[in-house]
């Protein structure tokens, strides 16, 4: 990043430094340290104080965004004296040049698209680059396939999500020969950005009095089990008057996904389709293909 780091410190400095790649704040260890603490303050005056590392001369910030600018602060007491130092981390570059309207979504269980728009004051030669770091191994993923608009990167397609974890840090850097470009960063939960496929293997079997609908839970990127799903069934009688209410049935995920409903012979032609959602978010998938049952002369 092309961010200026400005230090505000008394004469005997702790030499505080920040590595944005590892989110690690470190300083020179002092002999006979009795107390140390580090924290950051963001533009909204929110304070984040991480745990100190074992050596007590560094700390790592886990879940922070830096694009609005932050101030790091380190306090150290030794048996002789106290030290205090601030480190300003501004988002340098011309205001309004950073990528904006950034969003990502996971689809088909193992694909992800991220998109953004060029900043309103960005010069014509601006180029953006996306980097993703997972929360666990701090591994960095560089965008493998960019989506372009007139030569400018405005999106990214990933077809290998193995490096992601449940929460990930996204950074869009910018470059230009003319001026400094601000960066944009964001933390995204995979569970909030995944769009499920509809349920698969939908079948309907009827006897003289009932019909049984069965289906399989969709394959997902997230590690989900059966209780994490909520389903909606749309059982629809064909050839009914426009405006007739469809019967929408909510069904909780189960080891065997099934819904049994009364429907006696002779039965009119019906269709059923199913969609799925995460039970906690209810971000519905598209509907499955409609399955027809019953007869026209029912």
């Amino acid at each position: 990043e092309k961010s200026d780091l400005r230090t505000v410190a008394p004469a005997s400095s702790l030499n505080v430094r920040f590595d944005s790649r590892t989110m690690n704040l470190s300083w020179d260890c002092q002999e006979n340290t009795t107390f140390s603490k580090c924290f950051l303050t963001d533009k909204k005056n929110r304070v984040v104080e991480p745990r100190l590392s074992n050596n007590e001369c560094s700390c790592t910030f886990r879940e922070i965004c830096l694009h609005e600018g932050v101030t790091f602060e380190v306090h150290v007491n030794t048996s002789q004296r106290g030290f205090q130092q601030k480190l300003l981390y501004p988002n340098s570059g011309r205001e309004g040049t950073a990528a904006q309207n950034f969003s990502c979504f996971i689809y088909n269980a193992d694909l992800m698209n991220c998109t953004w728009a060029r900043g309103p004051t960005a010069p014509r030669d601006v180029q953006y680059f996306l980097y993703i770091r997972n929360s666990k191994r701090r591994r960095e993923i560089r965008c493998p396939y960019y989506i372009q608009d007139s030569g400018t990167h405005v999106g990214c397609h990933l077809d290998n999500l193995s490096g992601l974890t449940s929460r990930n840090y996204f950074l869009v850097n910018g470059t230009s020969r003319e001026i400094g470009i601000q960066f944009f960063d964001s933390l995204l939960d995979t569970k909030k950005i995944e769009r499920f496929n509809p349920p698969s293997n939908v079948t309907v079997r009827c006897n003289t009095t009932h019909c049984l609908v069965r289906w399989k839970q969709p394959r997902t990127y997230q590690k989900l089990s059966y209780l994490d799903f909520q389903y909606q069934l749309d059982v629809h009688r064909k050839n009914t008057q426009p405006g007739t209410e469809n019967l929408l049935i909510n069904v909780s995920g189960d080891l065997e996904n099934r819904y049994n409903f009364p429907s006696s012979e002779p039965r009119a032609k019906h269709s059923v389709k199913i969609r799925a959602a995460d039970v906690r978010i209810l971000n519905w998938s598209s509907w499955s293909e409609a399955i027809e049952f019953g007869s026209d002369d029912g």
Epitope: K223, L224, S225, Y226, L227, L255, R280
Partner: antibody, heavy 120, light 111 residues
């Protein structure tokens, strides 16, 4: 109807090992995650470990690490728990269970339990 | 000593409402992790009653409800019935212990 059928009660001497089996019927084990929990009158329920899809491996509770092994034979839809170097305080009912949700771990269906008694 | 604290027993007359509390800490319920509740009838295996704080698996009557706030959770049983007499356990994950943890259990007696 999905069921978990566990092996019968065991009586073991201190220092010995015990292997408890858990047979799944009505569903394929390869599509499920099995975890093991034990229950004692003094300590209540203790989670022992099970398959973690995030790590793509079986993870064990710290306090049982080194003494416990969990294995699976998907060809016969059976999961196994082996606990070695048994002590008298390992006397407990051991349950296998199917994970209903991973975040956080929620045990959706339980076996009937296997009583293991450790006594000299 | 269980990581999650529950009252050892509660009781109520048939038709009444009883609640069971489950108190944790900032490393488990307050982390925040979802809470699940299990019912164990005498001499049987536990059965899942509530998951994701307040969701009921299919087959569990709506007389059972639960909620979570801060570092504690509670289970409510309305219209108490004789066959609700059982031990009830709360459970969640504890990040300090890196695994699932349970409450010590609450015996519900129907008077």
């Amino acid at each position: 109807q999905v069921q978990l059928v566990q092996s019968g009660a065991e009586v073991k001497k201190p220092g010995a090992s015990v292997k408890v089996s858990c047979k799944i019927s009505g569903h394929s084990l390869s599509e499920l995650s099995i975890h093991w929990v034990r229950q004692t009158p003094t300590k209540g329920f203790e989670w022992m470990g099970g398959f973690d899809p995030e790590e793509n491996e079986i993870v064990y509770a710290q306090r049982f690490q080194g003494r416990v092994t969990m294995t699976e034979d998907t060809s016969i839809d059976t999961a196994y728990l082996t606990l070695s170097s048994l002590r008298s305080d390992d006397t407990a009912v051991y349950y296998c269970s199917i994970v209903g949700s991973f975040s956080p771990l929620t045990l959706g269906l339980w076996g009937k339990g296997t009583m293991v008694t450790v006594s000299s | 000593q269980a990581v999650l604290t529950q009252p050892s027993s509660v009781s109520g007359a048939p038709g009444q409402r009883v609640t069971i509390s489950c108190t944790g800490s900032g490393s488990n319920i307050g982390a925040p992790y979802d809470v699940s509740w299990y019912q164990q009838l005498p001499g049987t295996a536990p059965k899942l009653l509530i998951y994701h704080n307040n969701k009921r698996p299919s087959g569990v009557p709506d007389r059972f409800s639960a909620s979570k706030s801060g570092t504690s959770a509670s289970l409510a049983i309305t219209g108490l019935q004789a066959d609700d007499e059982a031990d009830y356990y709360c459970a969640t994950v504890d990040e300090a212990l890196s695994g699932s943890v349970f409450g010590g259990g609450t015996k519900v007696t129907v008077l």
